[in-house]
Each structure stands twice: as structure tokens, then as C-alpha cells.
């Protein structure tokens, strides 16, 4: 169950997709990736208040137990629900190759 | 890539499976679940230091960007990599039913 999308903390404060610009150097890829030189990294950032975008039953349980035992059980966390692929031009033993990474760019977010 | 399982923060401090005992009342299930009365909830808790149990390329990117921009990009988060099913005896409109939930108990953890 993908629960409420209304953020009680105010607009943009809850779990959602953000874009962070990063160079190959930032990512530690400069020695093995030729292109792209800069990546618009989409990632999931934000708070996960009670039942906000709860990914599944486990997330709902986590919310309940966090309310009861906040020092023991952390709140649910904002993570990718799905990904967009990304193609890199990378160095190989024989030269250069195209490689698709299916788990690189977040496409959608939920709390778990 | 499931990266290093060695926790640099000390034994038990990094992302791993924990068991938290919870009653139906704790979970808010008392009005619709008959059994079990108490659940040994397995969940993923702990820190995700650099490359510890990195789930995928996205987690590796997140680690790199968190190091560069800690106020903007959060560290990876400890979440279930897989689940164990759990059967509940629950109340229904017509009486009582067995229901299997596939996403209730964490089986394995990783950082993402």
C-alpha cells in the first residue's frame, strides 16, 4: 500500500525525488568513466512522517514501533521505489564500451 | 554490488537484522488481527558507513555525495533487501481468514 502523499511537515520537506549535479570526480568515477562528464543524479531525500508514502506493511510496522520506541527503532527511510537506467561510456581492458546501469538513477521514492 | 560486511564502527553498530518484540496493541492491529498475539518483528537497523553493504550503484553514489555534501545528501539507509512471509489470522466481514503478508518481516538487510 502506497500511503498518503500529503506532507504534514510542509511542502518539499517529506520524502521525494531530488536532483543533485555531480561530476565524475565527485563520484570517484574519473578513472573509469569517459562520459557523461557530469551526472544529474536523481535521489530520494526527505523525512518519512507517519504513513507518508509507506512502501509496504513493514514500513507501517516501523512507523508504529518508532512511535513507541524512538531510541530503538528508527523512522522509515526515504529510498528509491524504482530506477531509471543510465548508459555510461566506460573504459575496459580492450578500450571503451557502452554499459547500461539499471540501478543508478532513482525514478520514484517511498518510505521503508 | 553487495559491498563489504565489515563494520568499521564496531560489532553490531552497522546495518543488520534486529528483532523487536511487539504486541498487537503496539502495532495497532488489535482490532483486526486475532493471531499471533505477539510478533517477533525482524527489521533492519544500524549505520551505513562508506560502502558497507551497498545495495547497488545508487548506494555507492549516495555515499560519495554524502561525503561531499553531508547537509544536502543523507547517508545511505539500512533497509530490507528481502522479506520473510508471515501468516496472520485476521477478522473479515464474514468471519476469520488466514492471510499471508510477503512484505512484513525483514529477512536480509542492505544500505541504500
Amino acid at each position: 500500500a502506497r500511503n498518503g502523499d500529503h506532507c504534514p511537515l510542509g511542502p518539499g520537506r517529506c520524502c521525494r525525488l531530488h536532483t543533485v549535479r555531480a561530476s565524475l570526480e565527485d563520484l570517484g568515477w574519473a578513472d573509469w568513466v569517459l562520459s557523461p562528464r557530469e551526472v544529474q543524479v536523481t535521489m530520494c531525500i526527505g523525512a518519512c512522517p507517519s504513513q507518508f508514502r509507506a512502501a509496504n506493511m513493514h514500513a507501517q510496522i516501523k512507523t508504529s514501533l518508532h512511535r513507541l520506541k524512538p531510541d530503538t527503532v528508527p523512522a522509515p527511510c526515504c529510498v528509491p521505489a524504482s530506477y531509471n537506467p543510465m548508459v555510461l561510456i566506460q573504459k575496459t581492458d580492450t578500450g571503451v564500451s557502452l554499459q547500461t546501469y539499471d540501478d543508478l538513477l532513482a525514478k520514484d521514492c517511498h518510505c521503508i | 554490488a553487495r559491498n563489504g560486511d565489515h563494520c568499521p564502527l564496531g560489532p553490531g553498530r552497522c546495518c543488520r537484522l534486529h528483532t523487536v518484540r511487539a504486541s498487537l496493541e503496539d502495532l495497532g492491529w488489535a482490532d483486526w488481527v486475532l493471531s499471533p498475539r505477539e510478533v517477533q518483528v525482524t527489521m533492519c537497523i544500524g549505520a551505513c558507513p562508506s560502502q558497507f553493504r551497498a545495495a547497488n550503484m545508487h548506494a555507492q553514489i549516495k555515499t560519495s555525495l554524502h561525503r561531499l555534501k553531508p547537509d544536502t545528501v543523507p547517508a545511505p539507509c539500512c533497509v530490507p533487501a528481502s522479506y520473510n512471509p508471515m501468516v496472520l489470522i485476521q477478522k473479515t466481514d464474514t468471519g476469520v481468514s488466514l492471510q499471508t503478508y510477503d512484505d512484513l518481516l525483514a529477512k536480509d538487510c542492505h544500505c541504500i
Epitope: V87, I89, G95, L98 | -
Partner: antibody, heavy 121, light 110 residues
Framework: EVQLLESGGGLVQPGGSLRLSCAVS????????MTWVRQAPGKGLEWIGI???????YYASWAKGRFTISRDNSKNTVYLQMNSLRAEDTAVYFC???????????????WGQGTLVTVSS | DIVMTQSPATLSVSPGERATLSCQAS??????LAWFQQKPGQPPRLLIY???TLASGIPARFSGSGSGTEFTLTISSLQSEDFAVYFC????????????FGQGTKVEIK
């Protein structure tokens, strides 16, 4: 000696299909990306697509759906399957090693001599 | 879709003169660009890769420059064997990958 040799061209009717082969020798196909390019008579070059060493395929938008690139590493051969052929697909079809915009180690300029496909009724 | 646009379509140059060919990409392709020379009945011959790196066996009178969307091929002093058609090729990668050639520039004797 490193070589690329295209075959399978010829005359085909509109709406028909054809499979071109690119047999390579002198290197292990599994280690390289391979590109298909075509050239209509008296016209410019047209990029068709690439198959990577890992087997992923990438196509020009106009080629998606009609053209399929595959490879058989055991036979050291790359294929271009062309379906629903039209008169405008008449061209010389070339295979080339690598992604072309960056050089592989060793020989930088490995192209076959091309095979002519004529689509006509 | 990525589109590569070459200019001019034809360039008339005297032997010994300098020739400058342009190629523009519709997307930022960084340095994912190569230049090819082609003569009738022959496959293309790689001159420049990675926008500015001279391919092996290519004379130093050929040079490439640019990155992003604007690229240039320069032939510093045209020799008789340089009269041919020149093509640029760009490859764009992000969520997928696609390549495209420019329409070509014919370098002819003035």
C-alpha cells in the same frame, strides 16, 4: 590479421526481411562493442546502432522496432536483422569495431568493406 | 533524438590552404565525437576521436577541437589526397545511448 567481413546483402522485396552478418577475425568479439552503419547510394552515413560487449543494444530512433542487432561470440559474428524493409533502406551496410567516437586499444579504424542491400520490387 | 549538423555542405579550397569544418550537436555530447574521411567506394577512415585525439597513422595536419555542442576539424595545409567527404559522428548517452552522423562536408579543389 584483424578483419571484419559483412555478408548477406542482396535484392529483397519491399516488406521483406534480411539478416546481415559481420564475421570478425583476429580478435575476440566478446571483448568489443560493435557498430552498424549504413550509406544510401550517393548519400551520407547513417548510424544504425551498437551492441556492447555485454550484449546490450542501442539503436537510432528510426531503427527501433524494425532492426535488431545480435551477436554469437562462439561464431565471432555480429548480425543485423532487418524487417519490413522499404525502398529507402537501400544502402551499403557496414559493421565497425568499437563505439567509434573513442578508440579501442590497438587498431583504431576497423571497418568492413560493406554489403549492398537493394530493396525493390 | 541527437542531431549532428555540419557546415558548410561544400568547401572549395586550394591545395596548401587551411580548411575549417564545423559540426554542431543538438545535445551536450561532451567529447563523444569523431571525424571521418571518406572517398568513393571506400569505408570511412577515422581521423579524430574523443573530439581532439589524432587516430594512429593520421598526418598531424589534421586536428580536432571542441566539446559539448560545438566541434571543429582543421586541416592546416590541404594536400591533394585530402580532397574527400568528411563526416562527424556524435554519441549521446544518458538514460539510453544514440549516435548520429552529420550530413557531411565535401572538400573540393578550388
Amino acid at each position: 590479421e584483424v578483419q571484419l567481413l559483412e555478408s548477406g546483402g542482396g535484392l529483397v522485396q519491399p516488406g521483406g526481411s534480411l539478416r546481415l552478418s559481420c564475421a570478425v577475425s583476429g580478435f575476440s568479439l566478446s571483448s568489443y562493442d560493435m557498430t552498424w552503419v549504413r550509406q544510401a547510394p550517393g548519400k551520407g552515413l547513417e548510424w544504425i546502432g551498437i551492441i556492447s560487449g555485454s550484449g546490450s543494444t542501442y539503436y537510432a530512433s528510426w531503427a527501433k522496432g524494425r532492426f535488431t542487432i545480435s551477436r554469437d561470440n562462439s561464431k565471432n559474428t555480429v548480425y543485423l536483422q532487418m524487417n519490413s524493409l522499404r525502398a529507402e533502406d537501400t544502402a551499403v551496410y557496414f559493421c565497425a569495431r568499437g563505439i567509434l567516437v573513442y578508440a579501442d586499444y590497438g587498431d583504431h579504424n576497423l571497418w568492413g568493406q560493406g554489403t549492398l542491400v537493394t530493396v525493390s520490387s | 533524438d541527437i542531431v549532428m549538423t555540419q557546415s558548410p555542405a561544400t568547401l572549395s579550397v586550394s591545395p596548401g590552404e587551411r580548411a575549417t569544418l564545423s559540426c554542431q550537436a543538438s545535445e551536450d555530447i561532451y567529447t563523444n565525437l569523431a571525424w571521418f574521411q571518406q572517398k568513393p567506394g571506400q569505408p570511412p577512415r577515422l581521423l579524430i576521436y574523443a573530439a581532439s585525439t589524432l587516430a594512429s597513422g593520421i598526418p598531424a595536419r589534421f586536428s580536432g577541437s571542441g566539446s559539448g555542442t560545438e566541434f571543429t576539424l582543421t586541416i592546416s595545409s590541404l594536400q591533394s589526397e585530402d580532397f574527400a567527404v568528411y563526416f562527424c559522428l556524435g554519441v549521446y548517452t544518458y538514460i539510453s545511448a544514440e549516435g548520429a552522423f552529420g550530413q557531411g562536408t565535401k572538400v573540393e579543389i578550388k
